[in-house]
């Protein structure tokens, strides 16, 4: 039959080449002369010329050694034609299977593999996996089947078999207890991969196993007792630096210290933080200490780590005796800010209030007083008694010095300590209004037509507070009422000025008297420009210029 069974050819053949493999034969050769040819990759297409055929005998030829790792199987087609070139057979499939030889060593995927495992782990814990590949066949032969082994371990502490490797997966695991980072932080394993499932060619690589830190060492105070001196009242003052040692990995959570004040700080006066570089405990004052109240504090501080301990460990405690040093403290005004109500315009020499300070120190120190800031210069203060009196006219309506009816003064108290210290207080005078301002119209200049004049509405303002303001009353004086009328509106905050008789074009004075609810009267002269015009006007028309 025109059929060829798959042909097996071993790779790396020694020849001689061309080498006869198999003979193509068509039974049509009894009737006519047959010529054979082959096509396909390896014959007439890349890789061209690996195989050829003798055209008349049909011998299939191999022209060169084969490499299974490059091409494991060739699929060719055999053709048979007669002398006239006519095809006498259907194209026949020729399968050439390249059989494997163990011509490739295993290759590790990396020269150096890196893995890590926590110190103190139990035997059986997986560390890492190494991988080697072998290009040879691992399905039909053992040529490409890799077996892993550990050749050596450095260092050999605590003994030389700390790890094992799974012969087929390459998984490295811990086989013995006793991994201690503080003694051996890193192991170097020389690993082997051997093909033929362990009986063939060997290649080596390195596996570096880093032993990771576990918190198996407690931080210890060194020293455990401290004495410190702190001036009273100092806030954020560094009292003492506490030093610890920890055998775990520096700058790791297992090494970084966490400090806790266990006792002796009933008033919550102290705080302790960890210095980020030195790992020291920095004890500072959270509040000022009071020598007069307590001149010595004994603190008990415990140290642990950021990370929890992996096993039960004793914690280290330090004792710190803090001596509070006496400081001359400043007098303190009571209250620090004093609000006093006082009527504006009180007579000079009239007392305003007494404002005094207390000295926290135990000795009876003499305190003297003075005014530190009095923007308008309205007040004086007795240096011995702290009596504040008026020396100027307190004016509630003085917008330069008074804000929202309040006049602010700063006073100073000084003790006779060595050196002397000072304290300040704030005196807030709430000025009570008196009816010291009459109503004033706005604007005080008007322009009006002498024919069909428009009523002029003037706003009334009064610097005083209610009830010393509206309702207002208006009255024209000095014969102004002959030509003009003045009426206050219903709301009582505007006055309407009207021209009631014809006046020739000119400028006139209108005498307007306004009084407030407390009958405080104010006379204002309104300058009225009368124009020859009808109705509404802003400036007089025509060539006339007012005088």
């Amino acid at each position: 039959d025109w059929v060829v069974a798959p042909i097996s050819v071993p790779e790396n053949g020694k020849g001689p080449f061309p080498q006869r493999l198999n003979q193509l034969k068509s039974n049509k050769d009894r009737d006519t002369k047959i010529f054979y040819s082959i096509t396909g990759p390896g014959a007439d297409s890349p890789p061209e010329g690996v195989f050829a055929v003798e055209k008349e005998t049909g011998w299939l030829l191999l022209n060169k050694p084969l490499d299974r790792e490059e091409i494991a199987k060739y699929e060719l087609y055999g053709h048979a034609v007669s002398e006239n070139g006519a095809s006498v057979e259907e194209p026949m499939n020729i399968s050439i299977i390249v059989t494997d030889q163990n011509d490739n060593k295993p290759k590790f995927t990396q020269d150096t593999f890196r893995g890590s495992v926590l110190e103190g782990v139990l035997p059986g814990t997986s560390v890492m996996q190494v991988t080697a590949t072998d290009e040879d066949d691992a399905i039909y032969t053992y040529n490409g089947v890799v077996a892993y082994s550990i050749h050596s371990q450095e260092p050999k502490d605590p003994h030389d078999l700390m790890f094992t490797i799974h012969r087929s997966t390459g998984t490295i695991s811990v086989i013995s207890s006793g991994l201690d980072r503080e003694k051996v932080p890193e192991y170097t394993l020389t690993i082997q991969a051997t093909d033929m499932d362990g009986d063939g060619s060997t290649t080596t690589a390195v596996a570096v196993v880093e032993i990771l830190d576990a918190n198996d060492n407690a931080p210890m105070f060194d020293p455990q007792k401290y004495e410190a001196h702190v001036p009273e009242n100092a806030v954020g003052h560094e009292v003492q630096r506490l030093t610890v040692t920890d055998l775990d990995a520096p700058n790791s959570p297992a090494w970084r210290a966490t400090y806790l004040i266990m006792g002796g700080d009933d008033g919550d006066h102290f705080t302790i933080t960890t210095h980020p570089e030195s790992n020291q405990g920095i004890l500072t004052t959270r509040k000022g200490l009071d020598f007069e109240a307590k001149n010595q504090h004994t603190l008990y501080v415990e140290v642990t780590n950021e990370a929890p301990f992996v096993l039960k460990l004793p914690t280290s405690t330090a004792t710190i005796v803090v001596h509070v040093e006496d400081v001359n403290e400043a007098p303190v005004f009571v209250p620090p800010s004093k609000v006093v109500e006082v009527q504006e315009g009180i007579p000079t020499g009239e007392p305003v209030c007494v404002y005094t300070a207390e000295d926290p120190d135990k000795e009876n120190q003499k305190i003297s007083y003075r005014i530190l800031r009095d923007p308008a210069g309205w007040l004086a203060m007795d240096p011995d008694s702290g009596q504040v009196t008026a020396v100027g006219t307190l004016d509630r309506e003085d917008e330069q010095f008074v804000r929202n009816n309040i006049y602010e003064v700063m006073v100073l108290a000084m003790d006779n300590g060595s050196p002397p210290t000072t304290g300040t207080g704030t005196l807030l005078l709430t000025l009570i209004d008196v009816n010291d301002h009459g109503p004033v119209p706005e604007p005080r200049q008007i322009t009006i037509c002498n024919q069909s004049p428009v009523r002029q509405v003037l706003n009334i303002t009064d610097k005083d507070l209610s009830p010393h303001t509206s309702p207002f009353q208006a009255q024209l004086t000095d014969d102004s009422d002959i030509y003009w009328t003045a009426e206050v509106n219903e709301e009582g905050d505007t006055v309407v000025l009207s021209l009631k008789k014809f006046l020739k074009q000119d400028t006139y004075d209108v005498h307007l008297s306004l009084s407030d609810h407390g009958n405080k009267e104010q006379l204002t002269v309104i300058r009225a420009t009368v124009c020859d015009c009808h109705g509404h006007v802003e400036t007089c028309p025509g060539p006339w210029k007012g005088g």
């Epitope: 061309p18 010329g49 050829a52 003798e54 008349e56 030829l61 060169k64 050694p65």
Partner: antibody, heavy 121, light 107 residues
Framework: VQLVEESGPELVKPGASVKISCKAS????????MNWVKQRPGKGLEWIGR????????KYNGKFKGKATLTADKSSSTAYMQLSSLTSEDSAVYFC??????????????WGQGTSVTVSS | ELVMTQSPASLSASVGETVTITCRAS??????LAWYQQKQGKSPQLLVY???TLAEGVPSRFSGSGSGTQFSLKINSLQPEDFGTYYC?????????FGAGTKLEIK
């Protein structure tokens, strides 16, 4: 074994065609490959292509596809090469050379004496 | 296509001397290399095929060697009739390619 290129020197005009013959004797003409090789004056050898007279199978150097056409007549044991659309670049000596069929991997063991083709207007 | 690089391009030698010509293939051609000799105005003659097999009637002073990509032709005790141009040729895959030639002249 003898290969005789019967056509003498050819002088042809640009654009024309020429057909060179090569008569074989002393071996089984049908069962060996016939190669054709070009040599320009003072230059090296350049393979054009080959034909297997038994079934007429041909193989060309890509450079000469469309330029050269190879045929064979088994009855007269003669191989032919036709060159078309001639230019001055085609002026050369053309050899025929036999190659035995052993997977086509034998060298060219017998050569014709060569036919000179000159293309000139 | 395969490129065949031949060296030297030319050389002068005296009768009785030994000369070596080399040929390099741009890719592996195993042992499929032939050497030809061509005299002025004549057709090439096969000397060696399959890198080291002498063709019929070729004197034994000629010898070929090499495989893969590096080949050489050695002529011991040069004779007057050995002068001419020598070509190497790949006879592995088509297109069959030739070296540029080495012209051997009498000194």
């Amino acid at each position: 074994v003898q290969l005789v290129e019967e056509s003498g020197p050819e002088l042809v005009k640009p654009g024309a065609s020429v057909k060179i013959s090569c008569k074989a004797s002393g071996y089984a003409f049908s069962s060996s490959w016939m190669n054709w090789v070009k040599q320009r004056p003072g230059k090296g050898l350049e393979w054009i292509g080959r034909i297997y007279p038994g079934d007429g199978e041909t193989k060309y150097n890509g450079k000469f596809k469309g330029k050269a056409t190879l045929t064979a007549d088994k009855s007269s044991s003669t191989a032919y090469m036709q060159l078309s659309s001639l230019t001055s670049e085609d002026s050369a000596v053309y050899f025929c050379a036999r190659q035995r069929d052993y997977g086509a991997l034998y060298a060219m063991d017998y050569w014709g004496q060569g036919t000179s083709v000159t293309v000139s207007s | 296509e395969l490129v065949m690089t031949q060296s030297p391009a030319s050389l002068s030698a005296s009768v009785g001397e030994t000369v070596t010509i080399t040929c390099r293939a741009s890719d592996d051609i195993y042992s499929y290399l032939a050497w030809y000799q061509q005299k002025q105005g004549k057709s090439p003659q096969l000397l060696v095929y399959n890198a080291k097999t002498l063709a019929e009637g070729v004197p034994s002073r000629f010898s070929g060697s090499g495989s893969g990509t590096q080949f050489s032709l050695k002529i011991n005790s040069l004779q007057p009739e050995d002068f001419g141009t020598y070509y190497c040729q790949n006879h592995y895959v088509t297109p069959f390619t030739f070296g540029a030639g080495t012209k051997l002249e009498i000194k």
